[in-house]
Amino acid sequence: VPRWRQQWSGPGTTKRFPETVLARCVKYTEIHPEMRHVDCQSVWDAFKGAFISKHPCNITEEDYQPLMKLGTQTVPCNKILLWSRIKDLAHQFTQVQRDMFTLEDTLLGYLADDLTWCGEFNTSKINYQSCPDWRKDCSNNPVSVFWKTVSRRFAEAACDVVHVMLNGSRSKIFDKNSTFGSVEVHNLQPEKVQTLEAWVIHGGREDSRDLCQDPTIKELESIISKRNIQFSCKNIYRPDKFLQCVKNPEDSSCTSEI
């Protein structure tokens, strides 16, 4: 008789999940020689231990602590780039501006980027059929708790001027319900962080509006100011030119506004 299996509303675990996590870990240590001390098998074991045999709606930050410990990494605290709903451009930026880091440029972020995973209570099986959806099923699922945990730690580590890239094409440029809005903003440390600088990325070629005046940006400014952190905002009217100028800052066309 086939065993009854819980059907969740979200997609199941990414295929080849164990192989992918292990391969990504080894790749990361190959790319970052300063992380060669990391034992990738232990990292996978700790990752697995956080969700295997546990109810996928009952995951806690505590479950991820062994993984957090193994993935401890020092990034320059004044070179942190946060992002919300504009991941690809943020990653293109740090690929060019090598001294800046998004969460996905750290080991733990790199391991889990774009992956889904969950297990089942009381069995060692990984669920490849379905996993809990944050809205429809539960918020304390393995993926959401992971990102909440690593995002909190990343924001807590930040200092001096912290940058955030925001998507100016969305109806809510700053969304209180995003990971940035619900976790990172509230975990920046006022005693370490002097300024949060928002870069609002424009989508349309002819869009010359000052999106820094958007009501949601004003809301972000209010939240940040109440936390005794200064706020500044810049419009990035031409993201393609912006990236090109990061690559070639001496280009004559890069003195004008981008």
């Epitope: 190959e30 790319i31 020689p33 690929q95």
Partner: antibody, heavy 120, light 107 residues
């Protein structure tokens, strides 16, 4: 079995560009970093750069920074190395190579090499 | 960049001889060193990784030792197929670098 098969020999004019391909088979292409190494006639090996085929992220040796572009096509399991503004000193055998994850970070697997000849 | 200096550059030996090739690094590279064998017209072949670990399929007459800045490749009893050029490579830091090579010839 694991194989890296490179494109054929090329003869190029000074100032032009060359694009060498490296088709991977027998393993999951995105699971490994791909490196490019060159060797001028009678000379030592010289590391040029790497690509993470999963994300397209790259890093290049300073010497080649302005002239080399490494790319990857995941759907074709193929990595490419393009070298521009060719000069006679770029005449060399170009290799793609990768580690085995079980052999430290030494290059356990190599393509057969692609000879690029630059003539004026 | 880390410089690797191999010595000797040329080495003449006979079948059955024991030969040693040295590789010196300009700074501490721990055990992050590989040795390769290359024959004319062929791609290099990995012999040793992590300074002293034998790669799969490599005969046990090859061995590596050392750590830090001084490394050696030893072939305990030369076979006819061992005459080739040998390179050391460091992968402690980018850019990865190679030694200038040691050409092993038949005496």
């Amino acid at each position: 079995q694991m194989q890296l098969v490179q494109s054929g020999a090329e003869v190029k004019k000074t100032g032009s560009s060359v694009k060498v391909s490296c088709k991977a088979s027998g393993y999951t292409f995105t699971d490994y970093i791909m490196h490019w190494v060159r060797q001028a006639p009678g000379q030592a090996l010289e590391w040029m750069g790497w690509i993470d085929p999963e994300y397209g992220r790259t890093d290049y040796a300073q010497k080649f920074q302005d002239r080399v572009t490494i790319t990857a096509d995941r759907s074709m399991s193929t990595a490419y190395m393009e070298l521009s503004s060719l000069r006679s000193e770029d005449t060399a055998m170009y290799y793609c190579a990768r580690s085995a994850h079980t052999t430290g970070f030494g290059f356990a697997y190599w393509g057969q090499g692609t000879l690029v000849t630059v003539s004026s | 960049d880390i410089q690797l200096t191999q010595s000797p550059s040329f080495l003449s030996a006979s079948v059955g001889d024991r030969v040693t090739i040295t590789c010196r690094a300009s700074e501490d590279i721990y055990s992050n060193l590989a040795w390769y064998q290359q024959k004319p017209g062929k791609a290099p072949k990995l012999l040793i990784y992590d300074a002293n670990s034998l790669a799969d399929g490599v005969p046990s007459r090859f061995s590596g030792s050392g750590s830090g800045t001084e490394f050696t490749l030893t072939i305990s009893s030369l076979q006819p197929e061992d005459f080739a050029t040998y390179y050391c490579q460091q992968y402690n830091n980018y850019p990865y670098t190679f030694g200038q090579g040691t050409k092993l010839e038949i005496k």
